[in-house]
């Protein structure tokens, strides 16, 4: 898929032109009937600069650009306020984050991006990455988050429903790339790879700070729109739900898991690792004790001493003072 430097081949220019036209007409459409095609979680009114249509995100009240995707932070805030053979699959690194904390009401900066430090109503604070996923242990108001760490690699792990046969990998690849290009307006260079090992599909999005130019859709925003589409909760105004088809065959997703990799690995303290380690040790010890107990019991059963011991122990127990 990789291509060397040089001009894009002629066939690529037409879709690019169509994409620019679509963006322009999308913007015009927003002016005409004062709605936001790319974000249904907005309220639009004709009181923007120059008396033009202005759409404000619910929750924050920030004006949004309806010709592109709205940032995930503003969408989350709006959601919280709204009236809810060869192995080709990538193994997520040990630093990969999964969004286990679920929904929260985030603090967004003036550009609509996540603030590096997030706090809840009870003054519990934590640091997040550029997609708003927690990347440190939770602390108090004294917790410092020096910078917003960029999520530069997103791995979208999908499992599709059983079909008559496997999808053709190159058809699937082309369809998913088209989807991210046309529906989410993500530049094709940011879709690094599409892996397929039936029934698992993995979409890799990569976007370093240096690669992201002004006006480029953020991979975190594209992934969030995709996730909501897959769940049947489209954020687009008036558009039907996502109808994914590969050569006419519907692609129905039954499970989604998204891994986020940051430019700087997350900083979870040893407590978290220790807790996991202790859990493993406890399980092993319990298993060993249980195994030994089973051996002792079977041995005693064979020698006929078991019942006697049990009665004796019960007798001793009865002697204990009742609390």
């Amino acid at each position: 898929m990789a291509r060397g430097p040089g001009l894009a081949p002629p066939p690529l220019r037409l879709p690019l032109l169509l994409l620019v036209l679509a963006a322009v007409t999308g913007h015009t459409a927003a002016q005409d009937n004062c709605t936001c095609p790319t974000n249904k979680m907005t309220v639009c009114s004709p009181d923007g600069p120059g008396g033009r249509c202005q759409c404000r995100a619910l929750g924050s009240g920030m004006a949004v650009d309806c010709s592109t995707l709205t940032s995930k932070c503003l969408l989350l805030k709006a959601r919280m306020s709204a009236p809810k053979n060869a192995r080709t699959l990538v193994r997520p690194s040990e630093h990969a984050l999964v969004d286990n904390d679920g929904l929260y009401d985030p603090d967004c900066d003036p550009e609509g991006r996540f603030k590096a430090r997030q706090c809840n109503q009870t003054s519990v604070c934590w640091c997040v990455n550029s997609v708003g996923v927690r990347r440190t242990d939770k602390g108090d108001l004294s917790l410092r988050c020096d910078e917003l760490v960029r999520t530069h690699h997103i791995l979208i792990d999908l499992r599709h429903r059983p079909t008559a046969g496997a999808f053709n990998h190159s058809d699937l690849d082309a369809e998913l790339r088209r989807l991210f290009r046309e529906r989410y307006r993500l530049h094709p260079k940011f879709v690094a790879a599409v892996h397929y090992e039936q029934p698992t599909i993995q979409i890799e999005l990569r976007q370093n700070t240096s690669q992201k130019a002004a006006g480029d859709v953020d991979i975190g925003d594209a992934a969030y729109y995709f996730e909501r589409d897959i769940k049947g909760e489209s954020l687009f105004q008036g558009r039907g739900g996502l109808d994914l088809r590969v050569r006419g065959e519907p692609l129905q997703v039954e499970r989604t898991l998204i891994y986020y990799l940051d430019e700087i690995p997350p900083k979870f303290s040893m407590k978290r690792l220790t807790a996991g380690l202790i859990a493993v040790i406890v399980v092993v010890v319990v298993a060993l004790v249980a195994g030994m107990a089973v051996l002792v019991i079977t041995n005693r059963r064979k020698s006929g001493k078991y019942k006697k011991v049990e009665i004796k122990e019960l007798g001793e127990l009865r002697k204990e003072p009742s609390l």
């Epitope: 009114s45 009181d47 600069p49 120059g50 924050s60 004006a63 003036p110």
Partner: antibody, heavy 115, light 107 residues
């Protein structure tokens, strides 16, 4: 032309509630946010909150969340603000104002809370 | 919340002079600032919207400038009818906020 009509004054007892009205005319009521602003005598302007008549969405400044409730009646193009558990601190002039740029203002209702 | 700081609290000028009111935002708000005039016992009146856009019916001597965090309202030749309080207000994000106001006095 655009007009926002508010009653001139309201006198209520401490602890009671009051419902202030703002009747809009001369524009499409459901297309613009309606905001409410408080001004105590000799003081500055304070934003209370807003309501979008087209969908009933509301937002409040934190300090007014437990004090005011904004509603609309689209059939009569009227916005309302219900103020509860009134104290002397609530004595002020209350304005309704249209759109995000506050381009049109009502004359204001002077609320006096006194026993 | 976005804090708007207006300075000075009182401005005293002679008729015909040029006067400028300052408004500083606690964070970048682009051009989402509006200016209001409030005469004694009157309702506020919109003078300038989105930092520099003029309003029909407002005398041309009123103008606005600035973007980001620093904004200015200017009256290029003050008249006696301009005696009033002047407020800036931001509509960048909720909650909307006002500056504390500047009182214009005529010498």
């Amino acid at each position: 032309q655009v007009q926002l009509q508010q009653p001139g004054s309201e006198l209520v007892r401490p602890g009671a509630s009051v419902k202030l009205s703002c009747k809009a005319s001369g524009y499409t009521f459901t297309s613009y946010w309606m905001h409410w602003v408080k001004q105590r005598h000799g003081q500055g302007l304070e934003w209370i909150g807003n309501i979008y008549p087209g969908g009933g969405y509301t937002n409040y400044d934190e300090k007014f969340k437990s004090k005011g409730t904004l509603t609309v009646d689209t059939s009569s193009s009227t916005a309302y603000m219900h103020l509860s558990s009134l104290t002397s601190e609530d004595s002020a002039v209350y304005y309704c104002t249209r759109s995000s740029v506050f381009d049109y203002w009502g004359q204001g209702t002077t609320l006096t809370v006194s026993s | 919340d976005i804090l708007l700081t207006q300075s000075p609290a009182i401005l005293s000028v002679s008729p015909g002079e040029r006067v400028s009111f300052s408004c500083r935002a606690s964070q970048n708000i682009g051009t989402s600032i509006h200016w209001f005039q409030q005469r004694t016992n009157g309702s506020p009146r919109l003078l300038i919207k989105y930092a520099s856009e003029s309003i029909s019916g407002i005398p041309s001597r009123f103008s606005g400038s600035g973007s980001g965090t620093d904004f200015t309202l200017s009256i290029n030749s003050v008249e006696s009818e301009d005696i009033a309080d002047y407020y800036c207000q931001q509509s960048n994000s909720w909650p909307f906020t006002f500056g504390s106001g500047t009182k214009l006095e005529i010498k």
